[in-house]
Interface confidence: medium
C-alpha cells in the first residue's frame, strides 16, 4: 500500500460572483492493495478498498465578495490521517471519474 497524506489545491466557487479561489489543503492519495478474485466468496461481499481519509478536521477560509455580494466563509475538510478503506459515499464523491477538487466552473481564478 502507498496511501498517504498529500498536498492538494482545491477550488472554492463563489457562484454569485462567478469566480473561484484556490486554497491549499491536505488530502489522501495513493494506491491500495486489491485482489481481482477468480473465485468469489459469497460470504464476503466484494469491497474495493480505496485511499481515503481515516481522520479529518475542518478549516474555514474567508472568500472575498464582489459588487453586490459580501465576503463569505467557506469550511473545507483537511485530512489528518489516511488509510485504505471503503469509500464513504455519504461524505465523499466515490465515482470513478469525478471532476476533481481543483475544478472551477468559471474561467476566473483568484489567488
Amino acid at each position: 500500500n502507498s496511501c498517504e497524506l498529500t498536498n492538494i489545491t482545491i477550488a472554492i466557487e463563489k457562484e454569485e460572483c462567478r469566480f473561484c479561489i484556490s486554497i491549499n489543503t491536505t488530502w489522501c492519495a495513493g494506491y491500495c492493495y486489491t485482489r481481482d478474485l477468480v473465485y468469489k466468496d459469497p460470504a464476503r461481499p466484494k469491497i474495493q478498498k480505496t485511499c481515503t481519509f481515516k481522520e479529518l478536521v475542518y478549516e474555514t477560509v474567508r472568500v472575498p465578495g464582489c459588487a453586490h455580494h459580501a465576503d463569505s466563509l467557506y469550511t473545507y475538510p483537511v485530512a489528518t490521517q489516511c488509510h485504505c478503506g471503503k469509500c464513504d459515499s455519504d461524505s465523499t464523491d466515490c465515482t470513478v471519474r469525478g471532476l476533481g477538487p481543483s475544478y472551477c466552473s468559471f474561467g476566473e481564478m483568484k489567488e
Epitope: 485482489r35 481481482d36 478474485l37 477468480v38 473465485y39 468469489k40 466468496d41 459469497p42 460470504a43 464476503r44
Partner: antibody, heavy 116, light 107 residues
C-alpha cells in the same frame, strides 16, 4: 511452500459415489482463498466443479449441483469431494487447487476410471 | 455459462521463436483472465492472472494482453520446457470456465 495432494479410489462402479480427499500442507485452509475441485476429461477439457472458501461457504458448478458435495476437516487441513451417481462420463483426472486471483497451486491430480 | 474458445488446438514452433496463443470469451470478461501451462505429466501451473499480471516465479518471457472478449498469451524466445499445453480461464462470472487448450509442439 504450499502443497496439495489428492487421494481416493482410482476405480468406481457406475451409479456409485466418488469420494476424494485433498490434503493441504504449507497453508491453512481457514486463513484465506478458495479451495477447489477441478476435473479434466480425457479430451483435455477442464471443468471447475466447486469451491469451499476459508470462511466455510461453498459454491458449486450448477451443472453438478444435484450430485456434488464439498466439505472440509479444518483440524486435518483437508477438504473433500463427494460426487454421487457416477457414470462413465465422470471419468478423468481430478485436481484439487487453491484459488485467489488465479488458481495458483494445483495438486498432481488423481485419475478416475468408471467401470463395472 | 461463458464459453472460452481457443481456436488453435495445436501449434508448432522452434526453439527461440516467439509465439502467441489466443483465447476468446463469449462475452466481455473485464480482464478476469488467467493462463495455465500443463506439462505432459499432468502438472498444471498458473502463469498469468488478470490478463497481464505475471504469477510469482514465472519467467518474464511470458506475457499476456487483451481486453473485452479477446485475449492472448505470448511466449518469447521459446525454450524446451515451454513445449506444453496452455489453457485460458475466465473468472468474471460463475462458474469459472476454461478454454479447450492449445498444445505447443516443437517443429
Amino acid at each position: 511452500d504450499v502443497h496439495l495432494q489428492e487421494s481416493g479410489p482410482g476405480l468406481v462402479k457406475p451409479s456409485q459415489s466418488l469420494s476424494l480427499t485433498c490434503t493441504v500442507t504449507g497453508f491453512s485452509i481457514t486463513s484465506d482463498y478458495a479451495w477447489n475441485w477441478i476435473r479434466q476429461f480425457p479430451g483435455n477439457k477442464l471443468e471447475w466443479m466447486g469451491s469451499i472458501f476459508s470462511s466455510g461457504s461453498i459454491n458449486y458448478n450448477p451443472s453438478l449441483k444435484s450430485r456434488i458435495s464439498i466439505t472440509r476437516d479444518t483440524s486435518r487441513n483437508q477438504f473433500f469431494l463427494q460426487l454421487n451417481s457416477v457414470t462413465t462420463a465422470d471419468a478423468g483426472t481430478y485436481y484439487c487447487a487453491r484459488g485467489g486471483t488465479g488458481t495458483d497451486y494445483w495438486g498432481q491430480g488423481t485419475t478416475l476410471t468408471v467401470s463395472s | 455459462d461463458i464459453q472460452m474458445t481457443q481456436t488453435t488446438s495445436s501449434l508448432s514452433a522452434s526453439l527461440g521463436d516467439r509465439v502467441t496463443i489466443s483465447c476468446r470469451a463469449s462475452q466481455d470478461i473485464s480482464n478476469y483472465l488467467s493462463w495455465y501451462q500443463q506439462k505432459p505429466d499432468g502438472t498444471i501451473k498458473l502463469l498469468i492472472y488478470y490478463t497481464s499480471r505475471l504469477h510469482s516465479g514465472v519467467s518474464s518471457r511470458f506475457s499476456g494482453s487483451g481486453s473485452g472478449t479477446d485475449y492472448s498469451l505470448t511466449i518469447s524466445n521459446l525454450e524446451q520446457e515451454d513445449f506444453a499445453t496452455y489453457f485460458c480461464q475466465q473468472g468474471h462470472t460463475l462458474p469459472p470456465t476454461f478454454g479447450g487448450g492449445t498444445k505447443l509442439e516443437i517443429k
